[in-house]
Interface confidence: low
């Protein structure tokens, strides 16, 4: 068998909401993957498991099952959404994400994704990790790959 290539493209969109009382930020982060099947037979994308970390803490997890199949020598682009919550000991980020006098509300998130594919009863797992910048101050739609190169402003302590 030839390889199945998984390429994490980046953040497609991030939609933000807030809980005033709990000083909590909710970020729904939609990511894009390119999965390429270099074989002369179809493969099934059985599941995608993803998690997002902020400051070494897991803030969101997602799992998609029975996603799609990819034909021979074909590529499919797959979007998946991870709901994340920045709260509790990270509630200091709340001011940072919502102040107008801060123009750039980008935070650094670690995106981890594992794709499980199957063909002829054989299962294969491919994992990727990538640091991405996400704006926690407003709803944002990114050009694909753009969130990798944004400037990030860390809050002043």
């Amino acid at each position: 068998p030839r390889s199945i290539d998984v390429k994490y493209i980046g953040v497609k969109s991030a939609y933000v909401s807030y809980d005033v009382q709990k000083r909590t930020i909710y970020l729904n982060i939609t990511n894009t993957l390119n999965i390429t099947n270099n074989n002369y037979y179809s493969v099934e994308v059985e599941n995608i498991t993803a998690q997002v970390q902020f400051a070494k803490t897991v803030i969101g997890k997602a799992r998609l099952n029975n996603i799609t199949h990819i034909g021979p020598l074909d590529m499919k682009q797959i979007d998946y959404t991870v709901p994340t919550v920045i709260a509790e000991e990270m509630s200091y980020m709340y001011d940072f994400c919502t102040l107008i006098s801060i123009k750039v509300h980008n935070i650094v998130l670690m995106m981890q994704v594992t794709v499980t594919t199957t063909y002829f009863g054989h299962s294969e797992q491919i994992s990727q990790e990538r640091y991405q910048y996400v704006d926690c101050g407003r709803n944002t739609t990114y050009q694909l790959g753009q969130s990798e190169y944004l400037n990030v402003l860390q809050p002043q302590q």
């Epitope: 807030y18 005033v20 009382q21 000083r23 709340y94 001011d95 940072f96 994400c97 919502t98 102040l99 107008i100 006098s101 801060i102 123009k103 402003l153 809050p155 002043q156």
Partner: antibody
Framework: QVQLQQPGAELVKFGASVKLSCKAS????????MHWVKQRPGQGLEWIGN????????HYSQKFKDKATLTVDRSSNTAYIQLSSLTSEDSAVYYC???????????WGQGTTVTVSS | DIVMTQASPSVSVTPGESVSISCRSS???????????LYWFLQRPGRSPRLLIY???NLASGVPDRFSGSGSGTAFTLRISRVEAEDVGVYYC?????????FGSGTKLEMK
Amino acid sequence: QVQLQQPGAELVKFGASVKLSCKASGYTFTSFWMHWVKQRPGQGLEWIGNIDPSDSETHYSQKFKDKATLTVDRSSNTAYIQLSSLTSEDSAVYYCARSSNWDNFDYWGQGTTVTVSS
Amino acid sequence: DIVMTQASPSVSVTPGESVSISCRSSQSLLHVNGNTYLYWFLQRPGRSPRLLIYRMSNLASGVPDRFSGSGSGTAFTLRISRVEAEDVGVYYCMQHLQYPFSFGSGTKLEMK
């Protein structure tokens, strides 16, 4: 220690322009917004606008959009306000003040008194 | 634009007593993050303004705890307990929730 140094006074002719300076020291100039505030004799404070020295982004009060231009010189850690087409209404004390991302308007200059003479 | 109103141009107080200075905003200064973006400043005669209170109720560094700020989204109060001679001057509120930022017209504190 943090200081915002402004010249004490400027005497300018009616219809002319003037560029006032505010030299910052004792902190990282590009990490704080610089604001400009006007106070006419015996009157209250008016917010003119602010500038982010790191990239020169500005915000102005509508009233001062055609009157004031805010700039910075990062090499000398100095903020400037240029006032154009001066009239007697522009005779006032002009203060600079800094504010951080966490919003404390904690340091002010001593103010420059602008007198417009005909 | 947000309009800040200080209805009392002046207040008179006996040293040692308490006094309250009020300020209103034309719309709520309560942000989605739970903070209320209102400053109080004191300008003594012939001096630059000095920050007293930030985010409605937080005491600025070096300010005596005789000063306190309170309020709702649109109505705010600066309270000075045990007023001293050095407290005379003009007190200004200022909103910084939205551009353009704006000041109230000021309230002059005088001694009886």
